[in-house]
Interface confidence: low
């Protein structure tokens, strides 16, 4: 008797690995024998499609080599003209072992910046990604995170982050490892031990000691009163990324000796400076017209702007010069919170060097004013708009009386470095090379009222490292 088709083994979900065989079975009872057709995602599978094999009168569908794109819903439909057609459906889930499609690469980065090591993966189920540093699993913390993409992000890179890394992609079907890559952390030159000032008798021997560190290990040069040291012997040793330099001097005159540590990062250099004064005992008799004294800057607000242990002029017209000048900067610093990111570092450098002027230690300690060219660079180039506002406030008396020092310097009254390079102080933060300075975006479209001479670069490829400019 004729019998309508009945599917006796409904299709089930089939899991298959890529490149393996996957088979769906659709057993049908009917009379006469039915015609069985197959669809994938409601699209008919053609009998002559060579990727499939259809056997047992259509009851077996075999995918000969599973691909990623074979994922989907497969249905068999049986019809023999008796009763209605019947259908059964099942899913094919293509499983895939983890595969790293974008492996990490070697990275060289400066301490304090952000590093990202890529690790993009594919697989089904979606692989989980973890990282190994050296021989141990890497633990995430507030600085170190594995991103959704699998990449490793390290904020504020530290020296101890340097090492060998590899990423591991894992799912229920297996594990994939990337090749080992190296994260190298470079560190700006930093002075660990600054030379100490000495008050000695004429003809004494003095050894100045300067220790610096950085990655790569910095070189140390000594400067005497602004020039390369012409006499004295220098001994150096390097151990554990620390360079130790000793300058032995025979003292016949007072002087300011600066230790400069320099290291290279790609095409750029970073420098750190520390200075010591050598004074001769008989020369330091106080004089009536002495309006201040030289001392190492021990304050806080200008730490990021002035060289560490910079020798600054402290004005004795204040009862407590150090605290009074510090308070002046502190109060003014707050004004700078509202200026543009282009202006702010330049203004901070100008402010700190204006209030804590570089000091020339001699018979009479003398403040060294800022060079006119640097003042003009801040006024006309970096802070044109802001400068107008400041001048307006100063003229209208909007600054409180104790802020008299903060009336913006009159650039035209400052000495030019072209007259006497030692008579005025530079702002190292503005010592870009000429190319950088030319491309720096001015804050105004109007033409500067004074021609700004090109600022000299210390060497064709060097620059001065600007630390973070922030009250906190």
């Amino acid at each position: 008797l004729p019998k309508a088709p009945v599917i006796t083994t409904p299709l089930e979900t089939v899991d298959a690995l890529v490149e393996e065989v996957a088979t769906f079975m659709c057993a049908v009872e009917s009379y006469p024998q039915p015609e069985i057709s197959w669809t994938r995602n409601k699209i008919l599978i053609k009998l002559f499609d060579t990727r499939y094999s259809i056997r047992e009168n259509g009851q077996l569908l075999t995918i000969l080599s599973v691909e990623d794109s074979d994922d989907g819903i497969y249905c068999c439909t049986a019809n023999n003209g008796v009763g209605g057609a019947v259908e059964s459906c099942g899913a094919l889930q293509v499983k895939m072992k983890p595969k790293i499609t974008r492996p990490p690469i070697n990275v060289k980065i400066i301490e304090g910046l952000k590093a990202v090591l890529p690790c993009t993966t594919m697989g089904n189920p979606k692989p989980s990604v973890s990282w190994i540093k050296g021989d141990s699993p890497l633990r995430e913390n507030s600085r170190i995170a594995v991103l959704e993409s699998g990449s490793l992000r390290i904020h504020n890179v530290q020296k101890e982050d340097a090492g060998q890394y590899r990423c591991v992609a894992k799912n229920s079907l297996g594990t994939a490892y990337s090749k080992v890559v190296k994260l190298e952390v470079e560190v700006f030159a930093r002075i660990l031990r600054a030379p100490e000032s000495h008050n000695v008798t004429f003809g004494s021997f003095v050894t100045l000691h300067c220790t610096a560190t950085g990655i790569p290990v910095p070189t140390i040069t000594w400067i005497e009163n602004g020039n390369a040291v012409s006499s004295g012997s220098i001994q150096e040793s390097v151990k554990d990324r620390v360079i130790d330099s000793r300058l032995q001097l025979f003292i016949t005159k007072p002087g300011l000796y600066t230790c400069i540590a320099t290291n290279k990062h790609g095409e750029k250099f970073s420098t750190a400076k520390a200075a010591a004064t050598i004074s001769i005992a008989e020369w330091s008799k106080p004089q009536k017209d002495n309006k201040g004294y030289c001392a190492q800057y021990r304050g806080e607000v200008c730490n990021a702007v002035l060289a560490k242990d910079a020798l600054v002029f402290l004005n004795t017209s204040y009862a407590d010069p150090e605290e009074a000048q510090e308070l002046l900067v502190h109060t003014a610093w707050n004004e700078l919170k509202v200026v543009s990111p282009v202006c702010r570092p330049a203004a901070e450098a100008l402010l700190c060097n204006h209030i804590f002027q570089e000091c020339s230690p001699g018979v009479v300690p003398t403040p060294i004013p800022i060079c006119r060219e640097y003042c003009l660079a801040v006024k006309e180039l970096f802070c044109a708009k802001e400068w107008l506002v400041m001048e307006e406030k100063t003229h209208r008396g909007l600054y409180r009386s104790e802020m008299h020092l903060l009336s913006v310097p009159e650039c035209s009254k400052l000495p030019s470095m072209h007259w006497d390079p030692t008579a005025c102080a530079r702002l190292p933060h503005l010592d870009y090379n000429k190319e950088n300075l030319k491309t720096f975006p001015p804050m105004t479209s109007s033409k500067p009222s004074v021609d700004i001479p090109n600022l000299p670069s210390s060497s064709s490829s060097s620059f001065s490292v600007s630390p973070t400019y922030s009250m906190t």
Epitope: Q158, R298, E300, A304, S470
Partner: antibody, heavy 121, light 112 residues
Framework: ELQLVESGGGLVQPGGSLRLSCAAS????????MSWVRQAPGKGLEWVSA????????YYKESVKGRFTISRDNAKKTLYLQMNSLKSEDTAVYYC??????????????WGQGTLVTVSS | QAVVTQEPSLSVSPGGTVTLTCGLS?????????PDWYQQTPGQAPRGLIY???SRHSGVPSRFSGSISGNKAALTITGAQSEDEADYYC????????????FGGGTKLTVL
């Protein structure tokens, strides 16, 4: 990993002394200001003392001036708080905290787990 | 000695917005006080949230924001979550003859 680990707390009689230490690791210690902050049981936070990166100056809460001394040894990456003439109101958990820059009064961006100081007879 | 004032307690519904304030018993809070905000959950050390009025510490979710509103510093939590239930302290830098740092009494925030 940045870590601040306080030690030296304990039970002491009124008028006695204690020296707290804070061992720092995972960051360049000599580039940051540091502070001590305390918290009496069930009470709020109270700033005690601060010191900039170079130890060039020190700052104290009025009630501890002359009794407490903050200091640092950058070579040992350690911050100290010498507490003399202790009073019962000094009982608290003492936290060592890192400032976010070189200055003594930057924001506190990392804290230790604290060490308990109990002043009682 | 100036006293730093905060609301003793506040509550917010999950997903809601709440503003905590930090004032001075005498005078106004300005950006010269560099207001900082800290969060402390029971049994834990405090953690920095906001520094210098409105800058977020790294790792702090963007739902926390700081500002100065009127004569007070303010911490706003937009889209509060259950894990935001904690004590919140503000800290102010003071300068009156000598430098000082003062915490407020703290605000107990409950996420209902």
């Amino acid at each position: 990993e940045l870590q601040l680990v306080e030690s030296g707390g304990g039970l002491v009689q009124p008028g006695g002394s204690l020296r707290l230490s804070c061992a720092a690791s995972g960051f360049t210690f000599d580039d940051y200001g540091m502070s001590w902050v305390r918290q009496a049981p069930g009470k709020g936070l109270e700033w005690v003392s601060a010191i900039p990166w170079n130890g060039g100056s020190t700052y104290y809460k009025e009630s501890v001036k002359g009794r407490f001394t903050i200091s640092r040894d950058n070579a040992k990456k350690t911050l100290y708080l010498q507490m003399n003439s202790l009073k019962s109101e000094d009982t608290a958990v003492y936290y060592c905290a890192k400032r976010s820059g070189r200055i003594a009064f930057g924001a506190l961006d990392a804290w230790g787990q604290g060490t308990l100081v109990t002043v009682s007879s | 000695q100036a006293v730093v004032t905060q609301e003793p307690s506040l509550s917010v519904s999950p997903g809601g917005t709440v503003t905590l304030t930090c004032g001075l018993s005498s005078g106004s809070v300005t950006s010269s006080n560099y207001p900082d905000w800290y969060q402390q959950t029971p049994g834990q050390a405090p953690r920095g949230l906001i520094y210098s009025t409105d800058s977020r510490h790294s790792g702090v979710p963007s739902r926390f924001s700081g500002s100065i509103s009127g004569n007070k510093a303010a911490l706003t939590i937009t889209g509060a979550q259950s894990e935001d239930e904690a004590d919140y302290y503000c800290g102010l830098y003071m300068y009156s003859g000598s430098k000082n740092y003062v915490f407020g009494g703290g605000t107990k925030l409950t996420v209902l």
